[in-house]
Interface confidence: low
């Protein structure tokens, strides 16, 4: 039975040219996290494997930085980065948990950031 829940940064906004941290946190389960995939719509951005570390998709390598933790930092944001992002936690023995984040990249210099989720 899957008892875990994923907390995410939710809906967030950022300024064009800036950077943003995408973060998810898996709680309420003792399952072992074996791998976390970060995806934008159907496109793989990055993989963090518990044993092998990070693999950044080549087309995002210069704008995506691993971390903090299992999160992902997007840099040099463009309006085209607006959209849904998914953190997919592969766990044993529970299986797969998915979290959703919606990022809006604004042209305006008055981008209002929603409440930021911080992992202590």
């Amino acid at each position: 039975m899957m008892t875990g829940t994923i907390e995410t940064t939710g809906n967030i906004s950022a300024e064009k040219g800036g950077s943003i941290i995408l973060q998810c946190h898996l709680s309420s389960t003792t399952a072992q996290v074996t791998q976390v995939n970060w995806e934008q719509q159907d496109q793989l951005l990055a993989i963090c494997n518990a044993d092998l570390g990070w693999h950044i998709s080549p087309s995002f390598k210069d704008r995506v930085a691993p971390g903090p933790g299992l999160g992902l930092t997007l840099q040099s944001l463009t309006v085209n980065d607006t959209g849904e992002y998914f953190c997919i936690y592969h766990t044993y023995p529970d299986g797969t948990y998915t979290g959703r984040i919606f990022l809006e990249v604004l042209e305006s210099s008055v981008a209002e950031h929603g409440a930021r989720f911080q992992i202590p």
Epitope: C48, W54, H55, P58, G67
Partner: antibody, heavy 115, light 107 residues
């Protein structure tokens, strides 16, 4: 721009020691796995050692050929990677490269082990 | 340890031709395979990661394919600047072993 610059190579006698350094810039050092790879003259690449990132506790892995003789370490405050090489043998003669996750490599430093 | 076997040490190809370099792993590596190009006196240059993903700035005449244990690097319309030694590397399981290299020459 990501930069990796190795130093510390040179001529050393068999049984001797050497410490290689890899100065890095252009990225957040603590977020990346770092490795050492070597290449004897005219031969193939050989993966030597890995040190993981902060998120993975800076744990290390070694190839059988250097385990117990070489030690990989990192100075996260200065963004420098090290390879401490002890009990060197003639077959350790090679160009030593440091590499960052994502395909970035330095230009290498030459180590020659000879009497 | 996973052994990586590049069956051809040398390949001779005509300019403008097509070449396929093969790499076989001793165990499944789940597409965690990289291809590097190395020219004399230079550090290796990453061409492909994840078995098929072309690195930024690498010409589209390079492509990677394969799965499980068997992988290939293909170069179409061979150019003089493609003369180099090509290495595969698995990064599924430490130690992250390399193949022995395939040296490409112009016929």
């Amino acid at each position: 721009e990501v930069k990796l610059v190795e130093s510390g190579g040179g001529l050393v006698q068999p049984g001797g020691s050497l410490r290689l350094s890899c100065a890095t810039s252009g990225f957040t050092f603590i977020d990346y796995y770092m490795s050492w790879v070597r290449q004897p003259p005219g031969k193939a690449l050989e993966w030597l050692a890995l040190i993981r990132n902060k998120a993975n506790g800076y744990t290390t892995e070694y190839s059988v050929s250097v385990k117990g003789r070489f030690t990989i370490s990192r100075d996260n405050s200065q963004s420098i990677l090290y390879l401490q090489m002890n009990t060197l043998r003639a077959e350790d003669s090679a160009t030593y490269y440091c590499a960052r996750d994502g395909g970035y490599w330095g230009q290498g430093t030459l180590v020659t082990v000879s009497a | 340890d996973i052994q990586m076997t590049q069956s051809s040490s040398y390949l001779s190809v005509s300019l403008g031709g097509r070449v396929t370099i093969t790499c076989k792993a001793s165990d499944h590596i789940n597409n965690w395979l990289a291809w590097y190009q190395q020219k004399p006196g230079n550090a290796p240059r990453l061409l492909i990661s994840g078995a098929t993903s072309l690195e930024t700035g690498i010409p589209s005449r390079f492509s990677g394919s394969g799965s499980g244990k068997d992988y290939t690097l293909s170069i179409t319309s061979l150019q003089t600047e493609d003369v180099a030694t090509y290495y595969c590397q698995q990064y599924w399981s430490t130690p992250f072993t390399f193949g022995s290299g395939t040296k490409l020459e112009i016929k």
